[in-house]
Interface confidence: low
């Protein structure tokens, strides 16, 4: 069965950092492309960042392009996404999902998601 | 960006009826050389993730029910629900994987009209 | 080192066909998507094919499509193929064999189409 | 499909001089990919995602740009820069080159 648990959310001033891991298990890690899709409070779906099942291959929405960075670890299966200079619009519910091939397609499975909250 | 407009944003459908719901890209989604869509729709229950229900525009997710069916083509795509049930109250999206990057509609809220 | 040699090419009538090779080594084949680029005698780029990683999914440009069929071998040879039919003059080029992202090429095999 | 369009198509610069050249987009995209040539040798990859530098890439070269405009900029011209520099975008299939900039020196 496809896991994917996602971690390292919290609580950040604005200007800070976090680094968001996803664990994933169940299927071969490295032949799949993953992506981060973000979900503010009551608020619809945004794609943030995908990243080619080889990781050779990476993907920025243009709200975080240079302050986020994805990346993997194949021989760990798991999925990062490096924060920096944080916003208030930041604030949101992070999923990590896999999608259905190694490119990046539609996305078949989804973590439980990790909240991260910028605040002063 | 390809922008992505859903409607309506929210439909109230009695119980065994059918539920539509359109999806407008602002430019084409299909890959010619492969003649497939690149369109995905997605069903989102409170306090849930997202969960896959069609892909390539017509394609129905592992496990997704047979009176969930995605159509269209180019600009124009619809989610049909054949026969609503009480387990389909949920936001549904669709999302485009044609370019990067990557975009969903605003949401269309499916509710079960007393 | 990463290396991509192309082989295959050479002179062929119009409405011939040919298959072209890239074998790879010095990366975990595999792993990478892989593209093949031309370059016509002009000089003008142009992306070909592309195919995932593990074969199963393909794309062309629409001046290809249904006359080149792009595969791969992940288990043999690390070898990449694109196979060629109905072949036309202006599909003389210098066909490049290339790695996801196209940092990697290779040098290139030329296919010439001419009565 | 995505068309990529260079200017200027040829141009010649002195050694120390500055040099931009640009590649224009017909639908708005992510990114860009810059890739060098030099007569009878394949392309190689010099800038990669708008604005990265390719490995062994001297660090006068940079790349800049969003939406449907976008350029590599030497900062100081040198005999060896002289090449034709093609932009790639990769956001959306079928994936497409600029027609190229070359680029002599004076």
């Known amino acids: 069965e496809v896991q994917l648990l996602e971690s390292g959310g919290g609580l950040v001033q604005p200007g800070g950092s976090l680094r968001l891991s996803c664990a994933a298990s169940g299927f071969t890690f490295s032949g799949y492309a993953m992506t981060w899709v973000r979900q503010a409070p009551g608020k619809g779906l945004k794609w943030v960042s995908g990243i080619s099942g080889s990781g050779g291959s990476t993907y920025y929405a243009a709200s975080v392009k240079g302050r986020f960075t994805i990346s993997r670890d194949n021989s760990k299966s798991t999925l990062y996404l490096q924060m920096n200079s944080l916003r208030a619009e930041d604030t949101a519910v992070y999923y990590c999902a896999k999608t259905i091939n190694d490119i990046l397609t539609a996305t078949e499975d989804w973590g439980q998601g990790t909240l991260v909250t910028v605040s002063s | 960006d390809i922008v992505m407009t859903q409607s309506p944003d929210s439909l109230a459908v009695s119980l065994g009826e059918r539920a539509t719901i359109n999806c407008k890209t602002s430019q084409s989604v299909l890959y010619s050389s492969k003649k497939k869509n690149y369109l995905a729709w997605y069903q989102q229950k409170p306090g849930q993730p997202p969960k896959l229900v069609i892909y390539w525009a017509s394609t129905r997710g592992s496990g997704v029910p047979d009176r969930f069916s995605g159509s269209g083509s180019g600009t124009d795509f619809t989610l049909t629900i054949s026969s609503l049930q009480a387990e389909d109250v949920a936001v549904y999206y669709c999302q485009q994987y044609y370019s990067t990057p990557q975009t969903f509609g605003q949401g269309t809220k499916v509710e079960i009209k007393r | 080192e990463v290396q991509l040699v192309e082989s295959g090419g050479g002179l062929v009538k119009p409405g011939g066909s040919l298959k072209l090779s890239c074998t790879a080594s010095?990366?975990?084949?595999?792993?990478?998507?892989m593209s093949w680029v031309r370059q016509s005698p002009e000089k003008r780029l142009e992306w070909v094919a592309e195919?995932?990683?593990?074969?199963?999914?393909?794309?062309y440009s629409d001046t290809v499509t249904g006359r080149f069929s792009i595969s791969r071998d992940n288990a043999k040879n690390s070898t990449l193929y694109l196979e060629m039919n109905s072949l036309r003059s202006e599909d003389t080029a210098i066909y490049y064999c290339?790695?996801?992202?196209?940092?990697?090429w290779g040098q290139g095999t030329l296919v010439t189409v001419s009565a | 499909q995505i068309v990529l369009t260079q200017s200027p198509a040829i141009m010649s610069a002195s050694p120390g001089e500055k040099v931009t050249m640009t590649c224009s987009v017909s639908?708005?995209?992510?990114?860009m990919h810059w890739f060098r040539q030099k007569p009878g040798t394949s392309p190689k990859l010099w800038i990669y995602?708008?604005?990265n530098l390719a490995s062994g890439v001297p660090a006068r070269f940079s790349g800049s740009g969003s939406g449907t405009s976008y350029s590599l900029t030497i900062s100081r011209m040198e005999a060896e820069d002289a090449a034709t520099y093609y932009c790639?975008?990769?956001?959306?299939?079928?994936?497409?080159f600029g027609s190229g900039t070359k680029l002599e020196i004076k």
């Open positions: 195919i995932s990683s593990g074969g199963i999914h393909t794309y």
């Open positions: 995602t708008t604005s």
């Open positions: 639908s708005s995209i992510t990114y």
């Open positions: 010095g990366f975990t084949f595999s792993s990478y998507a």
């Open positions: 790639q975008q990769r956001s959306r299939y079928p994936f497409t």
């Open positions: 290339a790695r996801e992202t196209t940092g990697t």
